[in-house]
C-alpha cells in the first residue's frame, strides 16, 4: 500500500503567441481546482475509462478576479498535495490524466458552474520511494507545471511497495527465510503480500500479488472448492484430470464470515460485511484499534483507543463500509433529475443538465409554467422540462403573441383559395366543391354530398369557416 502524490506548481499561459484569455472576470470571479486520474500500465485508455489506480480532487483555489486589460497570469492554486492512495502494489508504469477545472462564482442560476479548462495526459515509469519527478505539460495555450512521486506506507517498502518490513523480534537476526530490510538494517523483511483477497486458508504466493491455490481449491482468490469425485455434468463428463468442477456449494454456504459478519456473493467469490471492531477478508482480524489504521481511503478513525472498545470509521464522501473500503457509485443513484448526465469527479458529483433545466441536480425546471403567461387567452401546458402555450384561435408562437396566419396550413381542400378573415378564415372553393373547407364534391345533377349547402349559398361561393 502507498500514496501517489501530485504537487501542482503553476497553471497559466504557455510560452509563445496566442496567450489565452483569463478564465475569470470581474463579472464572473472564479477559482481553480484539479482532478487527477491514475491507471496502471502504459495503455492509451480513453479519458472516460475507470481510474483503476485511483483518483483525487484538490481543494478549491483562492477566488480570482481578472484585472481588466491585464494578460492572464499564472492563476492562484489550491493549497496542498493531491493524494491518491493505492492499496495494492505500485505498478511501476502508469498513465495519468490531470484536469484543470474552473468554478465560476457568479450569481447565475444553479449556483457555481464548473467547466473543464484543460486536460493533460501522459504515461510514465516511476519507482515507489524515489525522489519527486518534475514535469511540464501543455494543453492548448495553457501550461501546467507539476511534480509527482509514489511513496509506500509503512510497513511496506520497495519499488512496488510489496515488501513488508517489521522491527526485528530478536536483536541479531531475522526469522527463517527472511532477509534484513535494506536500507533499514534494524528491520526484517516480512512475508510476501499476496493478491488482495487471496484466501489465507486455501491460497499462497511465491511472487507479490499472485494467488496460487492449494489442492482442492480454485478461482482467482482460491475460494471456490473443487469436487474431485467422478461425476457427469449435464454437458457430459469433465475432461479435468482431477475429476470435475460441480456447481457445489455457493461461496456463502456455511457463512465464511467470522465474528458475525454477513456474507454476500460476488461474481467471482464472496464479500464479508464486518461488524465494527473486525475486518479482513473473513472478518477474522479483531482487536483492532485506531492505531492500526483500519479506515481506508482517507476515512477518519474515532474511538477504539484499546482493543476492547470498537472503533468507528467516518468515511469521506464517495466511500462506505465499516472500514470505508467500498467506493460508492454515486451516479448509480441517478441523482441528476430530469434526464441530466451524471459525472462523478472523484470527491464531487456534477450534473450536466438538459436544456430547460438547471441547478446542482438539474432540479430547477426553467421552462415550467410558474410565472409564465401565455398572451391573448392562451393557456400554459407544462411537461417534461418544456412549457408550451396552447393558443386561442388566431394566435400562435411560443407565447401566443403572434397573430397566426389561418391560411398557413392550407386548410382549403381541392384547390380552394384561402382568405384570412378577422374571425377566422374563408375558403373560396374551386368549381365542383363546396363546404367550409371545400371538402365536399358537388354532384353533377346539382345535388351535393352531405352536408347540404346552406340555403342561398351556391357551390363556388366563399365558405366562411368560423
Amino acid at each position: 500500500a502507498g500514496v501517489f502524490e501530485l504537487q501542482i506548481h503553476s497553471f497559466g499561459p504557455g510560452p509563445g503567441p496566442g496567450a489565452p484569455r483569463s478564465p475569470c472576470s470581474a463579472r464572473l470571479p472564479c477559482r481553480l481546482f484539479f482532478r487527477v486520474c491514475l491507471k496502471p500500465g502504459l495503455s492509451e485508455e480513453a479519458a472516460e475509462s475507470p481510474c483503476a489506480l485511483g483518483a483525487a480532487l484538490s481543494a478549491r483555489g483562492p477566488v480570482y478576479t481578472e484585472q481588466p486589460g491585464a494578460p492572464a497570469p499564472d492563476l492562484p492554486l489550491p493549497d496542498g498535495l493531491l493524494q491518491v492512495p493505492f492499496r495494492d502494489a505500485w505498478p511501476g508504469t502508469f498513465s495519468f490524466i490531470i484536469e484543470t477545472w474552473r468554478e465560476e462564482l457568479g450569481d447565475q442560476i444553479g449556483g457555481p458552474a464548473w467547466s473543464l479548462l484543460a486536460r493533460v495526459a501522459g504515461r510514465r515509469r516511476l519507482a515507489a520511494g524515489g525522489p519527486w519527478a518534475r514535469d511540464i505539460q501543455r494543453a492548448g495555450a495553457w501550461e501546467l507545471r507539476f511534480s509527482y512521486r509514489a511513496r509506500c506506507e509503512p510497513p511496506a517498502v520497495g519499488t512496488a511497495c510489496t515488501r513488508l518490513c517489521r522491527p526485528r523480534s530478536a536483536p541479531s537476526r531475522c526469522g527463517p527465510g527472511l532477509r534484513p530490510c535494506a536500507p533499514l538494517e534494524d528491520e526484517c523483511e516480512a512475508p510476501l503480500v499476496c493478491r488482495a483477497g487471496c484466501s489465507p486458508e486455501h491460497g499462497f504466493c511465491e511472487q507479490p500479488g499472485e494467488c496460487r491455490c492449494l489442492e482442492g481449491w480454485t478461482g482467482p482468490l482460491c475460494t471456490v472448492p473443487v469436487s474431485t469425485s467422478s461425476c457427469l455434468s449435464p454437458r457430459g463428463p469433465s475432461s479435468a484430470t482431477t475429476g470435475c468442477l460441480v456447481p457445489g456449494p455457493g461461496p456463502c454456504d456455511g457463512n465464511p464470515c467470522a465474528n458475525g459478519g454477513s456474507c454476500s456473493e460476488t461474481p467471482r467469490s464472496f464479500e464479508c460485511t464486518c461488524p465494527r471492531g473486525f475486518y479482513g477478508l473473513r472478518c477474522e482480524v479483531s482487536g483492532v484499534t485506531c492505531a492500526d489504521g483500519p479506515c481506508f481511503n482517507g476515512g477518519l478513525c474515532v474511538g477504539g483507543a484499546d482493543p476492547d472498545s470498537a472503533y468507528i470509521c467516518h468515511c469521506p464522501p464517495g466511500f462506505q463500509g465499516s472500514n470505508c473500503e467500498k467506493r460508492v457509485d454515486r451516479c448509480s443513484l441517478q441523482p441528476c433529475r430530469n434526464g441530466g448526465l451524471c459525472l462523478d469527479l472523484g470527491h464531487a458529483l456534477r450534473c450536466r443538465c438538459r436544456a430547460g433545466f438547471a441547478g446542482p441536480r438539474c432540479e430547477h425546471d426553467l421552462d415550467d409554467c410558474a410565472g409564465r403567461a401565455c398572451a391573448n387567452g392562451g393557456t400554459c401546458v407544462e411537461g417534461g422540462g418544456a412549457h408550451r402555450c396552447s393558443c386561442a384561435l388566431g394566435f400562435g408562437g411560443r407565447d401566443c403573441r403572434e397573430r397566426a396566419d389561418p391560411c398557413a396550413a392550407r386548410p382549403c381542400a381541392h384547390g380552394g383559395r384561402c382568405y384570412a378573415h378577422f374571425s377566422g378564415l374563408v375558403c373560396a372553393c374551386a368549381p365542383g366543391y363546396m363546404g367550409a373547407r371545400c371538402e365536399f364534391p358537388v354532384h353533377p345533377d346539382g345535388a351535393s354530398a352531405l352536408p347540404a349547402a346552406p340555403p342561398g349559398l351556391r357551390p363556388g361561393d366563399p365558405q366562411r369557416y368560423l
Epitope: 444553479g110 443513484l333 441536480r361 425546471d365
Partner: antibody
C-alpha cells in the same frame, strides 16, 4: 448529535419585517444545504426556501419570492431568513432543516423544533 | 409545480395493525420521494428517503415502495409511538412540495 435551533419568531404587523435565525451544531455546517419549511396553524408542511452548502445557490417558493431572503454564515454555523412585506398568510411555525450531503436526494434529514411567526394587526 | 396527493387524510388503527399510506405525484418524480413523521409536539423526523431507503435510527417496521407517480409508506406492525401525522415530499423538481399529510389515530 445534529442540532438545529431556530429563533427570532414573534408577533409582527402586516407589511413588517422579521429575521429568523437557525443555529446549527453537531455536524460540519459548511458541507450541507439547509431548508426553511413552515407550517400554518392546523395545516401541512410547506417548503419555503433553500440555500446550498457554500451559499451560492438559493431557491424560494413562489409564495415568498421577492419578499424573503435566505442566507448563511458558515463561520458562525448560522442560517438566516429575512422576511419582509409580511402578510397574514405568512403566519406559521418556521422550521430549519438540514439537507442531505451533496443534495443527491433533496431530503430534509434533521429538523429544528421551530419558531412561531404571527402576522396580525 | 408538482402536486403531491396523499391518501387517506386520516385513518384509525390499532397497535399491531399493518398501515399503508399512499402518495401520488402529478408527474413522474423518478423515485425522489421522502417520507416524514410529525408528532403532536411539532417535531419532524425523516423516515424514508429515495422511496425505500430507511433513514438511520428508523425502525425496520417502516418501509417504502413505488415508482413513477405512485408511492407507498407501510408500517408493518403499528406501535404506540407511531401515532402521528405522516407527510410525503418530492425531491425531483423545484419547488419541493409536500403531500397534505395523513393523520394516524388510535382506534
Amino acid at each position: 448529535e445534529v442540532q438545529l435551533v431556530e429563533s427570532g419568531g414573534g408577533l409582527v404587523q402586516p407589511g413588517g419585517s422579521l429575521r429568523l435565525s437557525c443555529a446549527a451544531s453537531g455536524f460540519t455546517f459548511s458541507d450541507y444545504g439547509i431548508h426553511w419549511v413552515r407550517q400554518a396553524p392546523g395545516k401541512g408542511l410547506e417548503w419555503v426556501a433553500y440555500i446550498s452548502s457554500g451559499g451560492y445557490t438559493s431557491y424560494y417558493a413562489d409564495t415568498v419570492k421577492g419578499r424573503f431572503t435566505i442566507s448563511r454564515d458558515n463561520a458562525k454555523n448560522s442560517l438566516y431568513l429575512q422576511m419582509n412585506s409580511l402578510r397574514a398568510e405568512d403566519t406559521a411555525v418556521y422550521y430549519c432543516a438540514r439537507g442531505d450531503y451533496e443534495d443527491i436526494f433533496y431530503t430534509m434529514d434533521y429538523w429544528g423544533q421551530g419558531t412561531t411567526v404571527t402576522v396580525s394587526s | 409545480d408538482i402536486q403531491m396527493t396523499q391518501s387517506p387524510s386520516s385513518l384509525s388503527a390499532s397497535v399491531g395493525d399493518r398501515v399503508t399510506i399512499t402518495c401520488r405525484a402529478s408527474r413522474d418524480i423518478t423515485k425522489f420521494l421522502n417520507w416524514y413523521q410529525q408528532k403532536p409536539g411539532g417535531a419532524v423526523k425523516l423516515l424514508i428517503y429515495y422511496t425505500s431507503r430507511l433513514h438511520s435510527g428508523v425502525p425496520s417496521r417502516f418501509s417504502g415502495s413505488g415508482s413513477g407517480t405512485d408511492y407507498t409508506l407501510t408500517i408493518s406492525s403499528l406501535q404506540p409511538e407511531d401515532f402521528a401525522t405522516y407527510y410525503c415530499q418530492q425531491g425531483n423538481t423545484l419547488p419541493w412540495t409536500f403531500g397534505g399529510g395523513t393523520k394516524v389515530e388510535i382506534k
